[in-house]
């Protein structure tokens, strides 16, 4: 057969679908690849052709679009499970065609297994809510398209395994579920099973967000530094190992890119002949805050090291934070045996 | 320092209905989640409601849901709670609180009483 | 909601004693626990947050611990100023709630 623009296979969409549940794929060409959308591609007398290969399998093959209760369907872009089998699973192409034109693209779609309480393979969408915010509203995702406007489906909210009825501050409302006052009790797994009439059958559709309770905007603040500190003296005698901690506390704040580094004597240790190790650990609170420690060693210290300027630096969206550490060299008394023997005019 | 002054208590009949205002100071008051706590005569403490910073969230206890309503203007640094069909068991000193999630009630007023009886 | 509960009822110790307070949740509340002092006629305030740290300008006497569903409130050797009704709030899930109270009075 003639050439055909092929995408390969799109591995960005990682299509998860649950078990007995009807799913709706569009096909990617029209999203991701192609300038112009279905309608236009179908009245220039293009045609979308379906295929796929069977998990563990290399044969192309057709989809059954016979299969008892139109199992397998398409319209327009959008190729229909009503509802997914476990051996759904496979890689799925869509080809747009005709005598002069060809483009395709694959994607992987795994059908997922869940249990009673709804744990599963399957990747969730995380939601941040702030903490103590008034109201945060999650919405039951990725159910547009499967019933039309005049079905009013039923919804039932789950954190879990337990229904949220009589939750004080989490209210279920339809399609959305309400949040007053969050607080990181509210962390969890929250699970919306829509449930829809269609040609005399029910169907199904389960949908997880998974919330985190984060710290909020109000609370934000430039990194604070707690080491070094003017508190503390880092003195060695040359020979010894030197450990300078460099410890910066970050509130959470969305999307902020938290830095922290060194410089020695305004240089990157990088850039300085000396021998330096550095170490980094992060820890989060329980509302994503995060200290960053940076530990700064060199193994054997010279009297040139312990006269250098060691400055801890740190950076957010919120500003920047330096401080210096006090490092000086230990003064070692005389000993006093030989102090004694000087004194007596001993040779 | 912070400040919070509880004014509004008094005597009420059964039914009828006071406005509890809390005046607060010292504090970037727009920043933090306020509560009423009350506390009957010889009793323990109860939480009766809280707002969150923006105003926008309220929660309240199942006793006064309905009834109470808790407000505020962070314009005026105030705290609101207006209270209506009161019964005999509200009768209290109610207090405002300022809270944290990561520090609890951490300041109170003083207290004003509501005295429910006919 | 959450029931806090308190025990015992009623502490009765001498000045310069030890005492120790518990407070029990019937789920776990994490370290989202608070301990208050009320002195009569006065207003609560806040010993002890996150069930062990101490709030600003309160004595090094007064000590929590615990984390989970079991908390304690030491109070390492009682000064006169110390007699008072003491009770733990958890934070932890709405409702607010709060235990009955110790009341800890002069042996």
């Known amino acids: 057969s003639e050439r055909c623009d092929d995408w390969g296979l799109d591995t960005m969409r990682q299509i998860q679908v649950f078990e007995d549940e009807p799913a709706r794929i569009k096909c990617p060409l029209f999203e991701h690849f192609l300038k112009y959308n279905y309608s236009t591609a179908h009245s220039s007398g293009l045609t979308l052709i379906w295929y796929w290969t069977r998990q563990d399998r290399d044969l192309e093959e057709p989809i059954n679009f016979r299969l008892p209760e139109n199992r397998i369907s398409k319209e327009k872009d959008v190729l229909w499970f009503r509802p997914t089998l476990l051996n759904d699973t496979g890689n799925y192409t869509c080809m747009l065609r005709n005598t002069t034109y060809c483009s395709k693209v694959a994607f992987p779609l795994e059908v997922v297994q869940k249990d009673s309480c709804f744990n599963s393979a399957m990747r969730f969408p995380v939601h941040k809510m702030y903490i103590e915010h008034g109201i945060h509203k999650i919405t039951c995702p990725n159910v547009d398209g499967y019933f039309p406007s005049s079905v009013k489906p039923s919804v039932t909210w789950y954190k879990g395994c337990t229904e949220i009825v009589d939750f004080h501050n989490v209210l279920p409302e339809g399609m959305n579920l309400s949040f007053f006052i969050p607080l990181v009790s509210n962390n969890g797994n929250y699970t919306c099973v829509v449930t829809y009439p269609e040609n005399g059958r029910l169907f199904h559709l389960t949908r997880t967000v998974t919330v985190k309770v984060v710290g909020s905007p109000k609370d934000a603040l430039p990194p604070q530094i707690y080491s070094p500190n003017d508190r503390v003296v880092y003195e060695k005698e040359p020979g010894e190992e030197l450990v300078i901690p460099c410890k910066v506390y970050f509130s959470f704040i969305m999307d902020s890119h938290n830095e922290v580094w060194w410089t020695i004597d305004g240089k990157k240790p990088d850039d300085v002949t000396v021998d330096i190790t550095i170490n980094e650990s992060v820890s989060y609170s329980s509302t994503e805050d995060e200290t960053r420690t940076q530990i700064l060693s060199i193994k054997k210290v010279t009297p040139e090291d312990l006269r250098r300027n060691y400055v801890c630096h740190a950076r957010n969206t919120k500003g920047e934070a330096e401080q210096a550490a006090k490092v000086k060299q230990k003064v070692i008394p005389p000993r006093y045996t030989v102090e004694l023997a000087c004194g007596f005019g001993a040779t | 320092e912070v400040q919070l002054l509880e004014s509004g208590g008094g005597l009420v009949q059964p039914g009828g209905s006071l406005r509890l205002s809390c005046a607060a100071s010292?504090?970037?008051?727009?920043?933090?989640?306020m509560s009423w706590v009350r506390q009957a005569p010889g009793k323990g403490l109860e939480w009766v409601s809280a707002?969150?910073?923006?105003?926008?969230?309220?929660l309240y206890a199942d006793s006064v849901k309905g009834r109470f309503t808790i407000s505020r203007d962070n314009s005026k640094n105030t705290l609101y709670l207006q209270m209506n069909s009161l019964r005999a068991e509200d009768t209290a000193v109610y207090y405002c609180a300022r809270f944290r999630y990561y520090t609890a009630f951490d300041y109170w007023g003083q207290g004003t009483l509501v005295t429910v009886s006919s | 909601e959450i029931v806090m509960t308190q025990s015992p009822a009623t502490l009765s110790v001498s000045p310069g004693e030890r005492a120790t307070l518990s407070c029990r949740a019937s789920q776990s509340v994490s370290s989202n626990l608070a301990w208050y002092q009320q002195k009569p006629g006065q207003a609560p305030r806040l010993l002890i947050y996150?069930?062990?740290t101490r709030a600003t300008g309160i004595p090094a006497r007064f000590s929590g611990s615990g984390s989970g569903t079991e908390f304690t409130l030491t109070i390492s050797s009682l000064q006169s100023e110390d007699f008072a009704v003491y009770y733990c709030?958890?934070?932890?899930?709405?409702?607010?709630?709060f235990g009955q109270g110790t009341k800890v009075e002069i042996k």
């Open positions: 996150g069930a062990s």
């Open positions: 010292g504090f970037i008051f727009s920043h933090y989640g």
């Open positions: 709030q958890q934070y932890n899930n709405w409702p607010w709630t």
């Open positions: 707002i969150s910073y923006d105003g926008e969230g309220t």
